[in-house]
């Protein structure tokens, strides 16, 4: 592009500015020396006067104006033939340039295309590739599937013929145990039968062993008796001789005071001279009702009366009233003596209570209490404790002060609950107190963090069911 | 097998707070008495707190009231002690203990199964 332009500069000369794309090019046109400086009488664009001026003059001046008009006129075109001159060659240098330009852009172009041509390409023969291998790898695929299937078809027909076999065999063994059904029922009922004959016969054996015991007891208190009686004879015969033998002597026998045969409690047992421990029969205060409890006759001086005795688990505590009352178990093992005979029995003399404790860990432990009775009835056997010592704890597991007797079927506790039936078995619990010696037995190892087991928190704590209990008493002056 | 056991005991500045927790298995969880009991070194074992313990209530020794809190989340058998503005008294070996009685005292001998126990150790 090209555009010109003309202009006076500061000095006021003129000059031609010629602007061609990048380049701009500045002409000074050189100043004409014939030209009058402003302070002539005639400046060369003053107004005309109206006086003329001289002729040769204005010749003259015409004559300059044409010579500088010439010069101005040859040296503008030189100046048109050198811009002219100036113009092509720029014009061709800008023509190739753009041209060069062109083609630069055009080969920038063509080669993008190439590349993206062959970039293309390249993806396409990868895809394709990668379709052979998915190919491939499909029919692959399907050559082992369909290898699998065989297989398979196989399997599932062995299979057949074996479940075909195993049905066989099956209804054979069906077969079988239904004859042997049969057999074993015919079997069954047989042993059935010698099952009932043997209950009748262990039955028969059991009364026959009561009354064994029945007679062993009696004939260890009759033996017992039997050597009291022949000592006494031997005394009183030593005596008559020695009268005898005395010529002084008066011939009179003193008469021996009648042998009591009837027993309150161990300690008159034991007094009486019978020492050995076991089995006796103890009658009820002014009554001919009997009873029969173990007697410890080794254990502190012996005279010992057992009310209750715990050892393996084999009698179930959790009674009622009545059996509690009673008294149930067997004074050869596991027992309750009966709360109405120690009633009555603790009512008329001042008795003492020994506890005696087992754990599991081989330890023992006892309490004793100074004064122990068992109100009556009426007042559902409430317990009364005082004067505490022992081994099996500073306190007393038993609460104070005393509580009325619960079981299963009397709740007679201090609790919004029935202690005896969550605890189990019948005791004085208070709500529900630190002791229960009649719980429910526990095996070694299977003792610990028990709800209802054989329970006597100031010795073991709370939870510990203990291995062995036993509650005895004796008159406190015996 | 009646199986209790806590967590939650630490070492924590006084005025600070401890959460105890105790897992129980082996019995009906719901029908239980839980208390929380604890011992300090020398001294007794004492009821801090129960729950279920007096018709379905909850209850607190004096020296607890106002500043320790029980819970239960009976969907995981668990039994809470949250323990707030702790002091230096407040050391001890703290035990969960479960009872098949409803009570409204906290006596340690109306508690049959016990936890092993957690120590809670409060700094001044």
């Known amino acids: 592009y090209s555009n010109f332009r003309k202009s006076v500069d500061s000095t006021g000369r003129r000059q031609y500015q010629v602007q061609n794309g990048p380049c701009s090019y500045t002409f000074l046109l050189p100043e004409t020396d014939s030209c009058r400086s402003s302070s002539s009488p005639y400046m060369s664009n003053a107004v005309q006067r109206d006086a003329p001026l001289d002729y040769d003059d204005s010749v003259q001046r015409l004559q300059v104006l044409e010579n500088i008009l010439e010069n101005n006129t040859q040296w503008l075109m030189k100046l048109e033939n050198y811009i002219q001159d100036n113009m092509k060659k720029e014009m061709v240098e800008i023509q190739q340039n753009v041209v060069q330009n062109q083609t630069a852009v055009m080969i920038e172009i063509g080669t993008s295309l190439l590349n993206q041509t062959a970039a293309q390409t390249r993806k396409l023969t990868d895809v394709e590739a990668q379709v052979l291998n998915q190919t491939t790898r499909l029919e692959l695929q399907l050559l082992q599937h369909s290898i699998s299937t065989n297989k398979l078809e196989k399997q599932i027909l062995d299979q057949t013929s074996e479940i075909n076999k195993l049905q066989n065999k099956n209804s054979f063994l069906e077969q079988k145990v239904l004859d042997m059904e049969g057999k074993h029922s015919e079997q069954l009922q047989s042993m059935k039968e010698q099952k009932d004959e043997l209950q009748v016969l262990v039955s028969k054996q059991s009364s026959v062993i009561d009354e064994l015991e029945k007679k062993l007891v009696t004939a260890t208190v009759n033996n017992s008796l039997l050597q009291k009686q022949q000592h006494d004879l031997m005394e009183t015969v030593n005596s008559l001789l020695t009268m005898m033998s005395s010529p002084n002597s008066k011939s009179s026998v003193a008469i021996r005071k009648e042998e009591q045969t009837t027993f309150r409690d161990c300690a008159e047992i034991f007094k009486s001279g019978l020492t050995t421990s076991g089995i006796y029969t103890l009658t009820f205060p002014n009554s001919t009702e009997e009873i029969k409890a173990y007697c410890d006759m080794d254990v502190g001086g012996g005279g010992w009366t057992v009310i209750q005795h715990r050892e393996d688990g084999s009698v179930d505590f959790q009674r009622t009233w009545k059996e509690y009352k009673e008294g149930f178990g067997s004074p050869l093992g596991e027992y309750w003596l009966g709360n109405e005979f120690v009633s009555q029995l603790t009512g008329q003399h001042r008795y003492v209570l020994k506890i005696q404790l087992k754990d599991w860990e081989g330890n023992e432990a006892h309490s004793l209490y100074d004064h122990f009775y068992l109100a009556g009835e009426e007042s559902n056997y409430r317990i009364h404790l005082t004067g505490l010592t022992g081994t099996a704890g500073k306190i007393s597991s038993i609460s104070q002060p005393g509580s009325d007797f619960s079981t299963k079927d009397s709740d007679n506790d201090k609790c919004i609950c029935k202690c005896s039936q969550m605890l189990s078995g019948g005791w004085w619990f208070d709500a529900c107190g630190p002791s229960n010696l009649n719980g429910q037995y526990y095996p070694q190892k299977q003792n610990t963090n028990k709800f209802n087991g054989i329970k006597w928190y100031y010795w073991k704590g709370s939870g510990y069911s203990l291995k062995a209990t036993t509650m005895m008493i004796r008159p406190a002056d015996f | 097998e009646v199986q209790l056991v806590e967590s939650g005991g630490g070492l924590v500045q006084a005025g600070g707070s401890l959460r105890l927790s105790c897992a129980a298995s082996?019995?009906?969880?719901?029908?239980?008495?839980l208390g929380w009991f604890r011992q300090a070194a020398g001294k007794e074992r004492e009821g801090v707190s129960c729950?279920?313990?007096?018709?379905?209530?909850?209850y607190y020794a004096d020296s607890v009231k106002g500043r320790f809190t029980i819970s239960s989340d009976n969907a995981k058998n668990t039994v809470y002690l949250q323990m707030n503005s702790l002091k230096p008294e407040d050391t001890a070996v703290y035990y969960c203990?479960?009872?098949?009685?409803?009570?409204?005292?906290?006596?340690?001998?109306?508690?049959?199964?016990w936890g092993q126990g957690t120590l809670v150790t409060v700094s001044s």
């Open positions: 729950i279920r313990c007096s018709d379905g209530s909850t």
């Open positions: 203990a479960a009872s098949i009685v409803p009570r409204s005292k906290l006596e340690p001998y109306e508690y049959d199964a």
């Open positions: 082996g019995f009906t969880f719901d029908d239980y008495a």
